[in-house]
C-alpha cells in the first residue's frame, strides 16, 4: 500500500497514513500557584494539573515543570485561556500633572522553547488593558493558532502577573495542544 | 493492513485508520431565544439553528432540545462565541456607605452531561465583569478547548442572562465541535 | 484497501483515507498596513505576512492579495486575533443634554467570497464597546469556528478600523485556517 | 405556556399611590427582564423601565425617577410596579411584558387599569 | 432619549390592499427595532423583531425592513383580523421608546 493510492487528480504524494486517535494530545488545567523565583525579563511561567479532572497528557505528550513536550514534530494547535481578577484598578485617575497613568494590563503568552536555539520564541500574545473603576473585575483572555513544531520543542504559559490568575476553577483556565 | 505498519520508530500499534471527512462534526448558530423553564440551580441554556445557514451537524453528530449529541468517543475540539450587549451598567455606582456593589458580570459556560452521571461537568468557563458608565456595551466571550468525550455525552452552552444574548447575527453568537 | 474497512460497527462507508501531513493549512501573522482603497460598505481587510517568522502556507493553501485561498473542498477551523490599541475614548462622557454618545467599537469581521456568489458572507464577527475613560487602551478579539468551505473560496479578515491594529508583533494579531 | 396576569382595576385620588402586580407562570421568572408599558386612554406606548428578577436591578425612564419603584418576589414569581404623587395623567393601562431578549417582549399581561381621579 | 417618527398616523386600505408604514429613527439604531400590533382593548402583539425577523406563529404577509434610522413594516394582503394600530419601538439604547403608533382602517 502507498500513501498516495489515494491521492486526489492533481497527484499528489501523501505522508505515510496515519491514525488519529494515537496522535500526541494534552488539556491541562490550573492549580494554585506556588511562589517560585522567575526569569528575569520573562514573565513567569504557570504550572499545570496534567492528570485530574479534564487533564491529560497522552500518545507521548508529556507534561513536566511548566512544559509540554512536543514528542514528534508536526503541525499542532495550541490554545490556552487564562481568567485573571483584581481588585479596583485606579488606571483613570489623572496623575502626574494631569497625565493619565499607564494603565494596568494583563498579558497571556505561550512561549516556545527550544533547546538548541537560546531565545525563547513567542507564538501568542493576548493582552489587554485593564481600567475598571470603582469595583473588582474579572475576565478571561483566550489563544489559539496552528504551528510548526518540531520534536522536543517546550511549551509553557506565561502571565504579567501570577498573583491575578484565578485558579479557583479547571474550567476557567486552562492550556492544549494536539497534532493536526 | 494493521494499522502499525505506519508507526515511527518508537513503535506503536494505532487505531485502526480512519477517513477525516467522515468525523462526527457540528457547528451550530444563534437564534432569538424565548422564555422557558429552565433547570434550577443552573444558567439557562440556549437554544440553536442546526441546519440553515452557515449551520450543520453531520455524520451522526445530532442536534436535539438545546444539546449536542456526542456519537461516538473519543477527543473532541469543542467551541462557542456568545456576543452579549445591554443598556447602562451601574455596577460603579458607590452604593451602602462608599462601598461599591459586586459588578454586574455575564458568563458562559459549555457543560457536558453524561446520563450516567448525577451532576452535569462544566468544561470551560468564561466569565467577565461588565462595568461601563453611562452608555450601551456589547462584547464577545469566546471559549475552546479539546476534551475527551463518550458516545452518549450530551454538550450545550449556558449563560448568566439569556435576554442579554445578542442573537442577531449567525456570525456573532454560536457553538460546535468535532471528533479530532 | 476499501476505506470502509475500518468503519465502526453501525457500518459507514468512508471517504478515502488521507494522510494528514498533506492537508492544506495556513498562519498568517500581521504586518504593518499601508493606506488603501477600501470597498464602499465594507469593512477594510488587513493583509499579512505568508512565510516570515511564524508564518506559513502549505499543501496549496494559498495567500494572495489578503485572501486565504481555499484549495480544497472541506470543513477548515478557521481563526484570527486582532489585537486593537486606541488613544482615550471619551464615549462615556454625558454629551447633548444628558445623553450619552454612541459607544466607540472595535470589530474583526472573517470573511468568505465566493466568485459566484455576488455577496461575500460573514462566516465570524467579534464586536465589542469600547468605553475607557482617561488613558490608553488595548485588547484582543479572538475568533475561531469550523466551516464548509469549497474549492475556490476565499477567506479575509476585515476590521472596523485598521488605524488602530496593533501591527508590533506577530504574536499579538494572525490569522489562519486549516482542513479537518 | 407562557403567562403574566396582572392585578386588578383600582381608581386612586391625586397624590396616592399604586402598586400594580404582575405573576408570572410557564417560564422560569428570574431569566428574563420584565418591562413595565403604560398606555394613557386614546395616546399611545410609554415605557416606563425594567426589573432584572434574578437580581432585583432596574433601570427607570429619567421621567419616572424618584416615583416609580420596581421590585419583585421570586418566592410566588411575581413582579410589582408602584407608582407614587399620582397625578391626574397617570390615568392610563399599565403593562407588565417580558421576552427572550431585552429588545422586543414576546409576551404581555393582560393590562391594569388605574384611574387617578378626585 | 432616541425619538421615533412613525407615518402615517393613520392609513386606510381595502381587504386585499397592501400597506407600508414607515418609522424613522433620530439616530441611528442598528436593527434594534420591533414592531407591534395592538387592537381595542388588548395588550399589544410582537410581529417583528431585529428589523426584519418574523415572530413565531405571525402570518407571512407580515414583513419587516430597514437599518440605521429609516424602517418600513409592509402588509402585503390585508385581512380583516389587520385592522388595528401599529407600533414601532427601538431598543439599540435606553431608555426603549416606541412610535406614535399608526392606525390601519378600513376603507
Known amino acids: 500500500l502507498k500513501g498516495q493510492e489515494f491521492a486526489p487528480s492533481h497527484q499528489q504524494v501523501y505522508a505515510p497514513l496515519r491514525a488519529d486517535g494515537d496522535k500526541p494530545r494534552a488539556h491541562l488545567t490550573v492549580v494554585r500557584q506556588t511562589p517560585t523565583q522567575h526569569l528575569k525579563n520573562q514573565f513567569p511561567a504557570l504550572h499545570w494539573e496534567h492528570e485530574l479532572g479534564l487533564a491529560f497528557t497522552k500518545n507521548r505528550m508529556n507534561y513536566t515543570n511548566k512544559f509540554l513536550l512536543i514528542p514528534e514534530s508536526g503541525d499542532y494547535f495550541v490554545y490556552s485561556q487564562v481568567t485573571f481578577r483584581g481588585m479596583t484598578s485606579e488606571c483613570s485617575e489623572i496623575r502626574q500633572a494631569g497625565r493619565p497613568n499607564k494603565p494596568d494590563s494583563i498579558t497571556v503568552v505561550i512561549t516556545k522553547v527550544t533547546d538548541s536555539y537560546p531565545e525563547p520564541t513567542q507564538l501568542l500574545m493576548g493582552t489587554k488593558s485593564v481600567c475598571e473603576v470603582g469595583s473588582n473585575w474579572f475576565q478571561p483572555i483566550y489563544l489559539g493558532a496552528m504551528f510548526s513544531l518540531q520534536e522536543g520543542d517546550k511549551l509553557m504559559v506565561n502571565v504579567s502577573d501570577i498573583s491575578l490568575v484565578d485558579y479557583t476553577k479547571e474550567d476557567k483556565t486552562f492550556f492544549g495542544a494536539f497534532l493536526l | 493492513l494493521k494499522g502499525q505498519e505506519f508507526a515511527p520508530s518508537h513503535q506503536q500499534v494505532y487505531a485502526p485508520l480512519r477517513a477525516d471527512g467522515d468525523k462526527p462534526r457540528a457547528h451550530l448558530t444563534v437564534v432569538r431565544q424565548t422564555p422557558t423553564q429552565h433547570l434550577k440551580n443552573q444558567f439557562p441554556a440556549l437554544h440553536w439553528e442546526h441546519e440553515l445557514g452557515l449551520a450543520f451537524t453531520k455524520n451522526r453528530m445530532n442536534y436535539t432540545n438545546k444539546f449536542l449529541l456526542i456519537p461516538e468517543s473519543g477527543d473532541y475540539f469543542v467551541y462557542s462565541q456568545v456576543t452579549f450587549r445591554g443598556m447602562t451598567s451601574e455596577c460603579s455606582e458607590i452604593r451602602q456607605a462608599g462601598r461599591p456593589n459586586k459588578p454586574d458580570s455575564i458568563t458562559v459556560v459549555i457543560t457536558k452531561v453524561t446520563d450516567s452521571y448525577p451532576e452535569p461537568t462544566q468544561l470551560l468557563m468564561g466569565t467577565k465583569s461588565v462595568c461601563e458608565v453611562g452608555s450601551n456595551w456589547f462584547q464577545p466571550i469566546y471559549l475552546g478547548a479539546m476534551f475527551s468525550l463518550q458516545e452518549g455525552d450530551k454538550l450545550m452552552v449556558n449563560v448568566s442572562d439569556i435576554s442579554l444574548v445578542d442573537y442577531t447575527k449567525e456570525d456573532k453568537t454560536f457553538f460546535g465541535a468535532f471528533l479530532l | 484497501l476499501k476505506g470502509q474497512e475500518f468503519a465502526p460497527s453501525h457500518q459507514q462507508v468512508y471517504a478515502p483515507l488521507r494522510a494528514d501531513g498533506d492537508k492544506p493549512r495556513a498562519h498568517l501573522t500581521v504586518v504593518r498596513q499601508t493606506p488603501t482603497q477600501h470597498l464602499k460598505n465594507q469593512f477594510p481587510a488587513l493583509h499579512w505576512e505568508h512565510e516570515l517568522g511564524l508564518a506559513f502556507t502549505k499543501n496549496r493553501m494559498n495567500y494572495t492579495n489578503k485572501f486565504l485561498l481555499i484549495p480544497e473542498s472541506g470543513d477548515y477551523f478557521v481563526y484570527s486575533q486582532v489585537t486593537f490599541r486606541g488613544m482615550t475614548s471619551e464615549c462615556s462622557e454625558i454629551r447633548q443634554a444628558g445623553r450619552p454618545n454612541k459607544p466607540d467599537s472595535i470589530t474583526v469581521v472573517i470573511t468568505k467570497v465566493t466568485d459566484s456568489y455576488p455577496e461575500p458572507t460573514q462566516l465570524l464577527m467579534g464586536t465589542k464597546s469600547v468605553c475607557e475613560v482617561g488613558s490608553n487602551w488595548f485588547q484582543p478579539i479572538y475568533l475561531g469556528a469550523m466551516f464548509s468551505l469549497q474549492e475556490g473560496d476565499k477567506l479575509m479578515v476585515n476590521v472596523s478600523d485598521i488605524s488602530l491594529v496593533d501591527y508590533t508583533k506577530e504574536d499579538k494579531t494572525f490569522f489562519g485556517a486549516f482542513l479537518l | 405556556q407562557v403567562q403574566l396576569v396582572q392585578s386588578g382595576a383600582e381608581v386612586k385620588k391625586p397624590g396616592a399611590s399604586v402598586k400594580v402586580s404582575c405573576k408570572a407562570s410557564?417560564?422560569?421568572?428570574?431569566?428574563?427582564?420584565m418591562h413595565w408599558v403604560r398606555q394613557a386612554p386614546g395616546q399611545g406606548l410609554e415605557w416606563m423601565g425594567w426589573i432584572k428578577p434574578k437580581s432585583g436591578g432596574t433601570n427607570y425612564v429619567q421621567k419616572f425617577q424618584g416615583r416609580v419603584t420596581m421590585t419583585r418576589d421570586t418566592s410566588i414569581n411575581t413582579a410589582y410596579m408602584e407608582l407614587n404623587n399620582l397625578k391626574s395623567d397617570d390615568t392610563a393601562v399599565y403593562y407588565c411584558?417580558?421576552?427572550?431578549?431585552?429588545?422586543?417582549?414576546?409576551?404581555w399581561g393582560q393590562g391594569t387599569m388605574v384611574t387617578v381621579s378626585s | 432619549d432616541i425619538q421615533m417618527t412613525q407615518s402615517p398616523s393613520s392609513v386606510s386600505a381595502s381587504v386585499g390592499g397592501r400597506v407600508t408604514i414607515t418609522c424613522r429613527a433620530s439616530?441611528?439604531?442598528?436593527?434594534?427595532l420591533a414592531w407591534y400590533q395592538q387592537k381595542p382593548g388588548k395588550a399589544p402583539n410582537l410581529l417583528i423583531y431585529a428589523a426584519s425577523s418574523l415572530q413565531s406563529g405571525v402570518p407571512s404577509r407580515f414583513s419587516g425592513s430597514g437599518s440605521g434610522t429609516d424602517f418600513t413594516l409592509t402588509i402585503s394582503s390585508l385581512q380583516p383580523e389587520d385592522f388595528a394600530t401599529y407600533y414601532c419601538q427601538q431598543a439599540d439604547s435606553f431608555p426603549l421608546t416606541f412610535g406614535g403608533g399608526t392606525k390601519v382602517e378600513i376603507k
Open positions: 411584558a417580558t421576552g427572550g431578549s431585552q429588545d422586543a417582549s414576546d409576551f
Open positions: 439616530q441611528d439604531i442598528s436593527i434594534w
Open positions: 410557564g417560564y422560569t421568572f428570574t431569566g428574563y427582564y
